[in-house]
């Protein structure tokens, strides 16, 4: 059988909402990029905790092409994208893909290279100017001096494109100098410095709240006042008149 033509009324997979998994649920216009340090400064067991943190965060975001779009990239001396901002998949499937990010355990994880990748590949074209653009840089290591020559240039390039960079330093080997440089570039570039992956869970809600507060709410729907939004979930039809709030739960 041939595929049915896509008409304006066709429901894309990610438009079929999945119920929120937590009380806190970020419903804002946001493009969020997770950059995961794939160096051996994190053990494989610690990298599993890092992935758990990413998936935990994803559970607290209203992921869809209309609301929060996510990208997930593991970086070492190069970058490996697992999820792109335009990937049209169910949130549960995106979380499953994020859980399968492979541990590289490489000697080097180049923040310069991954920020360059973020600037020129992920945000090369701004296709959602109304959404906030945030990069969560999860870093546990220091790249060699020779690799960091253009670091500031890439951070400034991201600033020009209105991409907020939030560095999360993890453990004793995180590059504090680079973290401070990122912070200096823009007031929104708030850093979180943790002593180990064990602190990620403690900081998670603060980080999610911070990201969410940086993103705009959607403009009010242009439906006639007597109409409510209808959202379809797996096996459940719900009618909601809620406005899209940071913590609104559209079931």
């Amino acid at each position: 059988p041939t595929d049915a033509p896509v008409s304006p009324t066709t429901l894309y997979v990610e438009d079929i909402s999945e119920p929120p998994l937590h009380d806190f649920y970020c419903s804002r216009l946001l493009d969020l990029v997770f950059l995961l340090d794939g160096s051996s400064r994190l053990s494989e067991a610690e990298f599993e905790v890092l992935k758990a943190f990413v998936v935990d965060m994803m559970e607290r975001l209203r992921i869809s092409q209309k609301w929060v779009r996510v990208a997930v990239v593991e970086y070492h001396d190069g970058s490996h994208a697992y999820i792109g901002l335009k990937d049209r998949k169910r949130p549960s499937e995106l979380r499953r893909i994020a859980s399968q990010v492979k541990y590289a355990g490489s000697q080097v994880a180049s923040t310069s290279e991954v920020l360059k990748y973020t600037l020129f590949q992920i945000f090369s074209k701004i296709d959602r100017p109304e959404a906030s653009r945030i990069t969560l840089l999860l870093m546990a290591s220091q790249e060699p001096q020779r690799m960091s020559r253009n670091f500031v240039r890439y951070v400034q390039g991201l600033k020009k494109k209105k991409v907020i960079v939030i560095p999360v330093g993890i453990g004793p080997h995180a590059n504090l100098k680079q973290i401070r440089l990122i912070e200096k570039q823009a007031p929104e570039n708030k850093a979180f410095v943790l002593s180990s992956v064990d602190e990620l869970e403690q900081q998670r809600d603060e980080i999610v709240s911070y990201l969410c507060d940086l993103a705009p709410e959607a403009p009010p729907p242009t439906l006639p006042p007597d109409m409510a939004q209808v959202t379809v979930g797996p096996g459940l039809l719900g009618v909601s008149t809620l406005g899209p709030k940071r913590n609104s739960m559209v079931l």
Partner: nanobody, 125 residues
Framework: AVQLVESGGGLVQAGESLRLSCTSS????????TGWFRQAPGKEREFVAA????????YYADSVKGRFTISRDNAKDMVYLQMASLKPEDTAVYYC??????????????????WGQGTQVTVSS
């Protein structure tokens, strides 16, 4: 919280295989790292194998390396322990244990917060 239930134990001959299963009720199993431990009569409980919440990382006790395989299917909320080339010294009650994925996967039993009731495995010579 999560409740763990083991199944698949039984009586087998030396050299045969058995597959143990652990399922959870309560929160989805993908929220937990999972381990298998065993306790033979009159002995301390010992670590057998562990798997991280994503399935990306596994650990084995030296005594079972190459013979036992731990795996998981998060879509079905199941963790398995495939046991091959069984020996009489593998006779024990086998326990499934879990700890939250925000912690590192461990081999020590103190790291695990949730435990099943156990399933008996008997290997006769």
């Amino acid at each position: 919280a999560v409740q763990l239930v083991e199944s698949g134990g039984g009586l087998v001959q030396a050299g045969e295989s058995l597959r143990l299963s652990c399922t959870s009720s309560g929160r989805a199993f993908s929220y937990y790292n999972t381990g298998w431990f065993r306790q033979a009569p009159g002995k301390e409980r010992e670590f057998v194998a562990a798997i991280s919440w994503s399935g990306g990382l596994t650990y084995y006790a030296d005594s079972v390396k190459g013979r036992f395989t731990i795996s998981r299917d998060n879509a079905k909320d199941m963790v398995y322990l495939q046991m091959a080339s069984l020996k009489p010294e593998d006779t024990a009650v086998y326990y499934c244990a879990a700890n939250r994925r925000q912690k590192t996967v461990q081999m020590g039993e103190r790291a695990y917060d949730y435990w099943g009731q156990g399933t008996q495995v008997t290997v006769s010579s």
